[in-house]
């Protein structure tokens, strides 16, 4: 099949890093500077991504692969392939329309990126709060008070594994 296809379509012989040049009798021409083709048989080369401004070059563009960007210090990537850079906040904060704001009571963020998330509800697992939560840290759950009462067995069966039941915000 491949051989038949290549007889019918000379472009299928053009490897990655080249394009099938219609202006030159469908000869395989190298991709021009600042462009690439990551697969064979391409009729055009794609323009290389340029990492400008708050973006930093993580990997240079080559004739067969696009450039890859990350973010300058104080910023972090968002989305696939670092589509955007967003400013960092401190732990215990999240970025809002008005800049970095402290997490509301009952929520935390232990990173410089992302959003404030609700503290774990220990009682859903039949446990009690061992260490209170803060803006920067989730609560730590411990055995329920009943487990600690006199006469209670010191060996308690492990709580069933539970998927976090969060819904998108």
């Amino acid at each position: 099949f491949e051989r038949t296809r290549s007889l019918q379509d000379p472009c299928s012989n053009c490897p990655a890093g080249t394009f099938c040049d219609n202006n030159r009798n469908q000869i395989c021409s190298p991709c021009p500077p600042n462009s690439f083709s990551s697969a064979g048989g391409q009729r055009t080369c794609d323009i290389c991504r340029q990492c400008k401004g708050v973006f930093r070059t993580r990997k240079e563009c080559s004739s067969t692969s696009n450039a890859e960007c990350d973010c300058t210090p104080g910023f972090h990537c968002l989305g696939a392939g670092c589509s955007m850079c967003e400013q960092d906040c401190k732990q215990g904060q999240e970025l809002t329309k008005k800049g970095c704001k402290d997490c509301c009571f009952g929520t935390f963020n232990d990173q410089k990126r992302g959003i404030c998330r609700p503290w774990t509800n220990c009682s859903l697992d039949g446990k009690s709060v061992l260490v209170n939560g803060t803006k920067e840290r989730d609560v730590v759950c411990g055995p329920s008070p009943a487990d600690l009462s006199p006469g209670a067995s010191s060996v308690t069966p492990p709580a069933p594994a539970r998927e976090p039941g969060h819904s998108p915000q």
Partner: nanobody, 115 residues
């Protein structure tokens, strides 16, 4: 288990409008995105919206497309107006988790702009 399910794609004439939806479930999402991939082209960023309503758009769609999200319904939208032939693509919904460390993807919905 995270699920992102797009809908609303279809055939529309140049100058027309479409509204895409993406129903999300299974996690807290800090940021939700629309990307698109035209035939034979690289996937490209279209727009994003954060959980607290900050938005951003690619230059090619600014002023024509509007991204929004309904946090109660866990749904992301893309209102596309003044559509052009070059907007023809498969449109993908994507979402970053609460810590911006993982990106989840929908299966895509095809938008064709043609007379």
């Amino acid at each position: 288990q995270v699920q992102l399910v797009e809908s609303g794609g279809g055939l529309v004439q140049p100058g027309g409008s479409l509204r895409l939806s993406c129903a999300a479930s299974g996690d807290i999402f800090s940021i939700m995105f629309w990307y698109r991939q035209a035939p034979g082209k690289q996937r490209e960023y279209v727009a994003h919206i954060t959980s607290n309503g900050r938005t951003n758009y690619a230059d090619s769609v600014t002023g024509r497309f509007t991204i929004s999200r309904d946090n109660n319904k866990n749904t992301l939208y893309l209102q596309m107006n003044s559509l052009r032939a070059e907007d023809t693509a498969v449109y993908y919904c994507a979402a970053d988790d609460a810590t911006n460390t993982r990106t989840y993807w929908g299966q895509g919905t095809l938008v064709t702009v043609s007379s």
